[in-house]
Amino acid sequence: ALDTNYCFRNLEENCCVRPLYIDFRQDLGWKWVHEPKGYYANFCSGPCPYLRSADTTHSTVLGLYNTLNPEASASPCCVPQDLEPLTILYYVGRTPKVEQLSNMVVKSCKCS
Amino acid sequence: ALDTNYCFRNLEENCCVRPLYIDFRQDLGWKWVHEPKGYYANFCSGPCPYLRSADTTHSTVLGLYNTLNPEASASPCCVPQDLEPLTILYYVGRTPKVEQLSNMVVKSCKCS
């Protein structure tokens, strides 16, 4: 699986999850998030050669097409597969609110 | 929706479904498919600016991050959303077989 355990250890050049730390205030301008100050959102990148973690029959077909027609520029793309939520603390007036934001952290990638 | 109706009419530069005809024999080397000779597989391509058909909270966050940090090169990617099957005819010996291959045709795209 193209997950954080594998990708962060092996520094794969092909499609893999990459670490990306986002500081809410500095990187997004979100001053309303009190805690955490930032988090590892991560992202997916890297080429998708034929059969690499293909998501669907279409991505398999497209990968083969791209291998045999490299000038075609129609190839699968490396995108998130498994995502996890992030719990944040923010304030409404002086009232603290805890909320779980879904699909905030990429844990693995696929070629789609 | 970034579907064939919209994209094929408007020729959008941003993330959209693009027509791609694949000839089984010429483009894939698949001589075993008897009918059809080829089909419109289509594919997704184009930039994913902030909020364009964002798939998850993560793609929204990443789109904003990329807008504010354009040098970062971490941005969402345009990939298939809705796919449809394709029915093919092939032979095992002299026996004709009809099979439905799932997820063969891209009908719409999203930024993931």
């Epitope: 954080t4 962060f8 250890r9 092996n10 520094l11 990459r18 670490p19 990306l20 730390y21 500081d23 500095q26 990187d27 590892y40 992202f43 990148s45 | 940090n69 040098e71 970062a72 090169s73 971490a74």
Partner: nanobody, 119 residues
């Protein structure tokens, strides 16, 4: 909050050596790849080296390959850069960066450490 504190820079003659350190806090250091980047006077950030989370896999830019060695001590939350055969063109502020800076041009989160190579 993620914090990175670099140290070990200084003035050194051409051909000399230095070892830079980076103490990390506010995240699980052992889970993530780490990089060194540098900024020469009047230039942008340049990727120097990256090391995988367990320290086994390492990559270097062509400009430092064979002269610099990246390492890490996960027990001490510390990243190192051993710099040998230093050249005047290595003069820069060196920053450690969370993640793999070949893929993301990380914002410099630490204060950096100045390395000056001059006779």
């Amino acid at each position: 909050q993620l914090q990175l504190v670099e140290s070990g820079g200084g003035l050194v003659q051409p051909g000399g050596s230095l070892t830079l350190s980076c103490l990390a806090s506010g995240f699980t250091f052992s889970h993530y790849p780490m990089s060194w980047v540098r900024q020469a006077p009047g230039k942008g950030l340049e990727w120097v080296s990256v090391i995988g989370s367990d320290g086994a896999i390492k990559h270097y830019s062509d400009s430092v390959k064979g002269r610099f060695a990246i390492s890490r001590d996960n027990a001490k939350n510390t990243l190192y850069l051993q710099m040998n055969s230093l050249k005047p063109e290595d003069t820069a502020v060196y920053y450690c960066a969370e993640g793999d800076s070949r893929y993301v041009r990380n914002r410099a989160r630490g204060q950096g450490t100045q390395v000056t190579v001059s006779s």
